[in-house]
Interface confidence: low
């Protein structure tokens, strides 16, 4: 008996071939001997089966002795043995219809679990193997679970169902709802405008939800909500904003926040959360702000940074075009009695300059002592 695998919702074509290459009488029946369809001369006739409106044949092939049964919009319950009767012979074809669905929405938050459920006909014992967009293979029986979805899991999952040495392939598009970056860091000189961007790693037609940016300033004992906003069909509207600092927010995606000026008291780290409508859980992106200030007070030239810097970052003070006068893995460096000229304060990581602030030191003229 020939075995054919079909996919729920698809169309399948079961073949039946006569030895004579001409149009002769045929009919298709199911295992209960109920007629599905056949012919009467050049006309297609249909029987009383439940497939009635979904069954068809290809009349253009009849003259070649081919009498296929086409079943559209397959259902799991269409799984059956189909019999083609032609020229006093019977051809049996076993059709097994499988369905593979994500047990929840195919739009899932980063960190959530994906469960794929296989619908199969009674008596079948299929095995399933799925390959994620990043090439990870998972195997299972009636259900497959992937916990802790990552951004790289977004895309087309290809799942192969094996039964009776035959296979059928399913493709499921999964969208992992996440920000493009889990964390970002912005380096700014004191007084500069700060732009925070929170691009999403997915696109959907309608996006509705609400969000909030909590900020933990390095100097503050507790975190503070800087801004809350709503998202309606990709339009952003601010609900509440602190008076200090006064953030501005773009009205369109990607989410974009502007801090009028970087000040030491704002240096720290923030967590932007986005709760999407009809989704449990929230999207998160961490953002960090490092602020640099170079100052000269009397005979002391100081460079300081505030905010979350890694211990391997180097802070240096150097006269332009000269070797660094002082270079430390600390958050403040200074030079006493600096020479006149343009001094540079540099924050660097393995030789790569992350932030630079210039300060001009003027010559000091000694006042002559009066006799």
């Amino acid at each position: 008996k020939k075995v054919v695998l079909g996919k729920k919702g698809d169309t399948v074509e079961l073949t039946c071939t006569a030895s004579q290459k001409k149009s002769i009488q045929f009919h298709w029946k199911n295992s209960n001997q109920i007629k599905i369809l056949g012919n009467q001369g050049s006309f297609l006739t249909k029987g009383p089966s439940k497939l009635n409106d979904r069954a068809d044949s290809r009349r253009s092939l009849w003259d070649q002795g081919n009498f296929p049964l086409i079943i559209k919009n397959l259902k799991i319950e269409d799984s059956d043995t189909y019999i083609c009767e032609v020229e006093d012979q019977k051809e049996e074809v076993q059709l097994l219809v499988f369905g593979l669905t994500a047990n929840s929405d195919t739009h899932l938050l980063q960190g959530q679990s994906l469960t794929l459920t296989l619908e199969s006909p009674p008596g079948s014992s299929p095995s399933v193997q799925c390959r994620s967009p990043r090439g990870k293979n998972i195997q299972g029986g009636k259900t497959l679970s992937v916990s802790q979805l990552e951004l790289q899991d977004s895309g087309t999952w290809t799942c192969t169902v094996l039964q009776n040495q035959k296979k059928v392939e399913f493709k499921i598009d999964i969208v992992v709802l996440a920000f493009q970056k889990a964390s970002s860091i912005v380096y700014k000189k004191e007084g500069e405008q700060v732009e925070f961007s929170f691009p999403l790693a997915f696109t959907v037609e309608k996006l509705t939800g609400s969000g909030e940016l909590w900020w933990q300033a390095e100097r503050a004992s507790s975190s503070k909500s800087w801004i809350t906003f709503d998202l309606k069909n990709k339009e952003v509207s601010v609900k509440r904003v602190t008076q200090d600092p006064k953030l501005q927010m773009g009205k369109k995606l990607p989410l974009h926040l502007t801090l009028p000026q970087a000040l030491p008291q704002y240096a720290g780290s923030g967590n932007l959360t986005l709760a999407l409508e009809a989704k449990t859980g929230k999207l998160h992106q961490e953002v960090n702000l490092v602020v640099m200030r170079a100052t000269q007070l009397q005979k002391n030239l100081t460079c300081e940074v505030w905010g979350p810097t890694s211990p391997k970052l180097m802070l240096s003070l150097k006269l332009e075009n000269k070797e660094a006068k002082v270079s430390k893995r600390e958050k403040a460096v200074w030079v006493l009695n600096p020479e006149a000229g343009m001094w540079q304060c540099l924050l660097s990581d393995s030789g790569q300059v992350l932030l630079e602030s210039n300060i001009k030191v003027l010559p000091t003229w000694s006042t002559p002592v009066q006799p």
């Epitope: 509207s237 601010v238 509440r240 904003v241 008076q243 006064k246 773009g250």
Partner: antibody, heavy 120, light 105 residues
Framework: IQLQQSGPELVKPGASVKMSCKAS????????INWVKQRTGQGLEWIGE????????YYNENLKDKATLTADKSSNTAYMQLSSLTSEDSAVYFC??????????????WGQGTLVTVSA | SPASLAVSLGQRATISCKAS??????????MNWYQQKSGQPPKLLIY???NLESGIPARFSGSGSGTDFTLNIHPVEEEDAATYYC?????????FGGGTELEIK
Amino acid sequence: IQLQQSGPELVKPGASVKMSCKASGYTFTDYVINWVKQRTGQGLEWIGEIYPGSGSDYYNENLKDKATLTADKSSNTAYMQLSSLTSEDSAVYFCARKGENGNSLAFAYWGQGTLVTVSA
Amino acid sequence: SPASLAVSLGQRATISCKASQSVDYDGDSYMNWYQQKSGQPPKLLIYAASNLESGIPARFSGSGSGTDFTLNIHPVEEEDAATYYCQQSIQDPCTFGGGTELEIK
């Protein structure tokens, strides 16, 4: 901080008009420019706003097919074009900017207004 | 309300504004008040229900929360003859009240 608007306009029904709002005294790209309509002897109606920094705009649903907002960063000027004018569009149009800190959600700075008269 | 109001010089003028829904959020009321004189643009008087804008005389004060707000002017002066508008800024699009015309007797 000043917002200087262009002069009065007399236009025919069906035509279009483009008015300007030149900002000075602050960093133009840091603040949103809003536009507000006031028909003679009537109240105020918010039309929309534009972010000069990014060029992104946002409109009152009732008026979004009427107005088009643009901004030119090089000249610190915001523009509003009104199309398919009818007598209903005869009004004074103000540009306005919100404040800073506490008054950041109120219109603290206003242009002097541009009078548009639609008449055959 | 009211649409117009006549108050004697030196007396108190009270103008009310009722929002169709609450304009409060997290302890703040997003209601602003403006004064507009003929041929001039509106001028911000009060922001966030009760905060006096810089440069505005202390005889102007605002109060209220939720849906009911009041602008008080006391004592009224000649130069206060104008139309006064309330405006909510909690929800886009922001909307203005119909205005109250104040006449000084």
